[in-house]
Interface confidence: medium
């Protein structure tokens, strides 16, 4: 269950680092959303190798992706898993380690010389084969740092948000991904109640801009669950 995954996100005692200062003893630290990691020993830290619950790739490290730990496992329980090295099987770019991307279900090198012409091809073809995923979230590493000399403007093809200019994010549009504007206050946003639901979006929205969060519009509280309107609102 999700609770058991959350509870197993243990805190371990580590030896004091050389010259290392410490967090304030006895303080409690909360993770958003909703996970509490109590402080205590000065040199405690969250064990990076324990299951780390996630809802999307961006919540994991750049060398990880978010998925169910078991094949065909409970879709509601997802954790950060180590990225896959070259020539390993994949279903989307985020599964492949930095410097690689997913092509025809295999992690391949994102060599500058041949990759540029394949961006759109791989995004579109991955939808039509056995490994279709709609490329859930953008690749988060140095995958395309060499390819894009200037940041993508609105409408430019991208793989991840850092490929886009400031104020834009990389979001799905039909079967490819393009730079779209980050949402402003009052704009309709998408709140994913269940992991996996964003895989159904053909026209993905950006996230809310800085200082905003996606919340139910106040006058829509009475509406049924399925029709509740979410908008970007100030924290």
């Amino acid at each position: 269950t999700l609770n058991s995954v959350l509870n197993s996100n243990a805190i371990k005692n580590l030896p004091p680092p050389l010259g290392g200062a410490a967090g304030h003893p006895g303080s409690a630290v909360s993770a958003a959303p909703g996970i509490l990691y109590p402080g205590g020993n000065k040199y405690q830290t969250i064990d990076n190798y324990q299951p780390y619950p996630c809802a999307e790739d961006e919540e994991c490290g750049t060398d990880e992706y978010c998925a169910s730990p078991t094949r065909g496992g409970d879709a509601g329980v997802q954790i950060c898993l180590a990225c896959r090295k070259r020539r390993k099987r994949c279903m989307r770019h985020a599964m492949c380690c930095p410097g690689n991307y997913c092509k025809n279900g295999i992690c391949v090198s994102s060599d500058q010389n041949h990759f540029r012409g394949e961006i759109e091809e791989t995004i579109t073809e991955s939808f039509g084969n056995d490994h279709s995923t709609l490329d859930g979230y953008s690749r988060r590493t140095t995958l395309s740092s060499k390819m894009y000399h200037t940041k993508g403007q609105e409408g430019s093809v991208c793989l991840r948000s850092s490929d886009c200019a400031s104020g834009l994010c990389c979001a799905r549009h039909f079967w490819s991904k393009i730079c779209k504007p980050v949402l402003k206050e009052g704009q309709v946003c998408t709140k994913h109640r269940r992991k996996g639901s964003h895989g159904l979006e053909i026209f993905q929205r950006c996230y809310c801009g800085e200082g905003l969060s996606c919340r139910i519009q106040k006058d829509h509280h009475q509406a049924s669950n399925s029709s509740r309107l979410h908008t970007c609102q100030r924290h």
Epitope: A31, A32, Y37, K42, T45, E58, G61, T62, C80
Partner: nanobody, 125 residues
Framework: EVQLVESGGGLVQAGGSLRLSCTAS????????VGWFRQAPGKEREFVTG????????YYADSVKGRFTISRDNAKNTAYLQMNSLKPEDTAVYYC??????????????????WGQGTQVTVSS
């Protein structure tokens, strides 16, 4: 090598707001965890809040939860700390720090590699 520069500190009345900025030079910033720590006179430096490489995951000390908000703009190589409903006990030097890890699991000082010089925040009652 990443260099961090904090700005936005100052004197504010209790109940007021301040917004701190942490601007980084160096490429590693956009793929690393960023945290804010603070040190009040005569006290240890303590963790305030942290954010993972993408901004999708944030952590807060209980003492600031609901009042402080951390965010980042990787395109501008900048992290922000919005501090609302400030209290006199929030008075401290606030430090921005960046770690090598991309995950927001770094809650303690020794997990951070690069540090700013700090900016003073004083909350008067």
């Amino acid at each position: 090598e990443v260099q961090l520069v904090e700005s936005g500190g100052g004197l504010v009345q209790a109940g007021g707001s301040l917004r701190l900025s942490c601007t980084a030079s160096g490429r590693a910033f956009s793929s690393s965890v960023v945290g804010w720590f603070r040190q009040a006179p005569g006290k240890e430096r303590e963790f305030v809040t942290g954010i993972n490489w993408s901004g999708a995951r944030t952590y807060y000390a209980d003492s600031v939860k609901g009042r402080f908000t951390i965010s980042r703009d990787n395109a501008k190589n900048t992290a922000y700390l919005q501090m609302n409903s400030l209290k006199p006990e929030d008075t401290a030097v606030y430090y921005c720090a960046s770690g090598r890890d991309s995950r927001a699991r770094a809650l303690f000082e020794y997990e951070y590699v690069w540090w700013g010089q700090g900016t003073q925040v004083t909350v008067s009652s």
